[in-house]
Interface confidence: low
């Protein structure tokens, strides 16, 4: 059935022992009662009792207390099942009886006789409650209670849903009091027969088949399926989609396995230096002013910047250094300047004006020349013209760039990739053109790939006096005189102290 | 004998208000708790509104809410339902009833209902 309507009886007070006739029992009314359970009607009448009736065994005489009884014979609360939605509304007839018969079968037993009854009719809903009710007339009082319930399996306001809970192939679901189906944790659907997967777990490239599970599709690895397999021996690269390998910055060949970027990987050079993938060790560090070695981990003396102006010679202290200025300069760097116009200071066509009353002066410089004195070519290269750490070098009226391997263009704006093999011998610098790598030699070499060895060495006639150090410049024929402290000059051929018959060349 | 007697239905406009009245004879009204419910053709019965004999009030239809309320008057033996901003849906046969208990817990007694037409 779906449901059940229970009738718990209480008490049935009968004192003075009497029939609804007006006769008394005798020696005592045995008491049974007679239920019947059927469709609401605002008029009781006789007929089928349509949704059940129950009979008990003689439960006491006259008046008693109906204690509850779970099984066997007399059982209370009272059970009419019923096995239709149930409507809400019902009728109910509660007869006592007397039998002078047998007390477990009194229905059975002729002379019986009815001692009361009474009929209710009303609105129930499904529930648990107990609605408690008492009826009196003349002679009777009844006591007792009744609801309606649905039977396992059943649910909802009229039990009429069937729902049982199941957790198999077919379904993992318990049900709601309602008779909803309620899903186990980890399983969804209409029937609860979907498993959840994992949180996260890849739509389309993971499935599963019980919950909190991702089994990845071919191609696919991770714990959320959201990885796709890169091609077998792929060393150094991803994929966006299964089978691929797109290597890594810095990593080049088929698989991924060929380091193109030392520098990122291993951060050779110290000291600040700028670091470029070229070289026979796949990288060549250029220190900074001060800094030598293979590293630019050496520090070098703290002239080796030149901060002397005007001609003025460096002398290396502890942790510093001390310029000796030439003649009409003084200050750190010999920046300040004791000349007048009378002095003739402002060279290369310069022309001079006086300041503060003639005590001072300032030159105008022509086109192209720079400096307090005029002394200094103008250098394009202030602007930082040249791209990713391209080397400027004045020539002249012009400017050009000198490109790190794997760059070119007029401002080494263009990355090339095809000086990876480090062509260049001897540290030539490779720049990749679209006819193949090109190199640039540095000084002392020559040749398609710095292979040639030069001969001729512009510091090889000892151009540089007074035991000045002489560095070949950025063309063969070029030099530079590093001067000892107490001479000046532009092959340091002067001592301090001299009076200046000659211009002063910073 | 219990008796409840509603009163006060008929055919009201969308949006519309009525104001239904239940009379109780036949016990101590003050003792018991009487509520509303209501019976659409073809539909279950809905509980509406109840108030207790202490005055406390539930409200058993979500779809009310706001638009009815439910007051008793123990000097004249009344229960009253105000009605407003009526809806086709409110469309019904509404019963007053009681429990018969103090509490608003089920339906012992009812009347024999009034017909509410919400309809323009």
């Known amino acids: 059935g779906s449901g059940i309507f229970q009738l718990r009886l209480q008490e049935f007070v009968n004192q003075r022992g009497m029939l609804a006739n007006g006769q008394s029992c005798e020696p005592g009314c045995r008491t049974f009662f007679r239920i019947c359970l059927k469709h609401f009607q605002a008029t009781f009448s006789e007929g089928p009792c349509t949704f059940g009736n129950v009979s008990t065994p003689v439960l006491g005489t006259n008046s008693f207390v109906v204690r509850d009884k779970n099984s066997g014979s007399g059982r209370n609360p009272l059970q009419l099942p019923f096995n239709f939605t149930w409507p809400g509304t019902f009728s109910l007839n509660i007869q006592a009886w007397h039998t002078p018969g047998d007390d477990l079968r009194p229905e059975t037993s002729p002379g019986n006789s009815l001692i009361s009854q009474i009929i209710i009719q009303g609105s129930l809903a499904v529930g648990k409650i107990w609605r408690t009710d008492e009826q009196n007339d003349t002679l009777t009082r009844l006591s007792y209670s009744y609801r309606v319930i649905c039977s396992d399996n059943y649910y909802g306001e009229s039990c009429s849903r069937l729902c049982k809970k199941r957790d198999d192939h077919f379904g993992h679901y318990e049900c709601q009091p309602d008779g909803s189906l309620s899903c186990l944790p980890g399983w969804t659907g209409k029937y609860c027969d979907q498993p959840i997967c994992l949180s996260g777990c890849h739509e389309q490239n993971g499935y599963c088949s019980k919950p909190d599970e991702c089994i990845c599709r071919p191609g696919w690895q991770g714990r959320l399926c959201n990885e796709c397999i890169p091609h077998n021996g792929c060393r150094h690269g991803t994929c966006s989609i299964p089978w691929q390998c797109a290597c890594d910055e810095g990593w080049g060949g088929l698989f991924c396995d060929q380091d193109l970027n030392y520098c990122t990987h291993h951060s050779p050079c110290k000291n600040g230096s700028t670091c470029s993938n070229s070289g026979p060790k796949g990288y060549t560090c250029t220190c900074l002013p001060g800094y030598t070695g293979e590293h630019c981990e050496l520090g070098l003396s703290k002239c080796a910047s030149n901060p002397c102006r005007n001609g003025g010679s460096c002398k290396d202290q502890e942790n510093s250094y001390h310029c000796l200025c030439p003649p009409g300069y003084y200050g750190q760097h010999c920046e300040h300047s004791t000349l007048t116009c009378a002095d003739s200071p402002c060279f290369n066509g310069g022309s001079c004006r006086e300041r503060n009353q003639g005590s001072s002066y300032a030159c105008e410089c022509p086109p192209n020349f720079t400096g307090s004195n005029c002394e200094k070519k103008v250098d394009r290269c202030t602007s930082n013209p040249c791209a990713n750490g391209g080397q400027c070098q004045n020539r002249g009226p012009s400017r050009t760039c000198r490109c790190r391997p794997g760059f070119t263009g007029t401002h080494c704006e263009l990355h090339i990739s095809d000086c990876a093999r480090s062509p260049c011998a001897h540290g030539g610098t490779c720049h990749d053109l679209e006819n193949g790598p090109v190199c640039t030699c540095p000084a002392g070499f020559s040749g398609r790939r710095c292979e040639v060895r030069i001969t001729h060495d512009a510091c090889a006639s000892g151009p540089c006096f007074n035991g000045a150090t002489c560095y070949t410049g950025l063309s063969p024929n070029n030099f530079v005189c590093n001067c000892p402290y107490g001479f000046v000059g532009s092959r340091c051929e002067f001592p301090v102290g001299l009076p200046p018959s000659f211009p002063w060349v910073a | 004998e219990v008796q409840l007697v509603e009163s006060g239905g008929g055919l009201v406009q969308p949006g519309g208000s009525l104001r239904l009245s239940c009379t109780a004879s036949?016990?101590?009204?003050?003792?018991?708790?009487i509520g509303w419910f209501r019976q659409a053709p073809g539909k279950e019965p809905e509980g509406i509104s109840c108030?207790?004999?202490?005055?406390?009030?539930?409200y058993d239809a979500d779809s009310v809410k706001g638009r009815f309320t439910i007051s008793r008057d123990n000097a004249k033996n009344t229960v009253y339902l105000q009605m407003n901003s009526l809806k086709p849906e409110d469309t019904a046969v509404y019963y007053c009833?009681?429990?018969?208990?103090?509490?608003?817990?089920?339906?012992?007694?009812w009347g024999q209902g009034t017909q509410v037409t919400v309809s323009s």
């Open positions: 009833a009681t429990p018969g208990i103090a509490a608003c817990r089920g339906i012992h007694y």
């Open positions: 036949g016990f101590t009204f003050d003792d018991y708790a």
């Open positions: 108030i207790s004999s202490s005055g406390s009030i539930t």
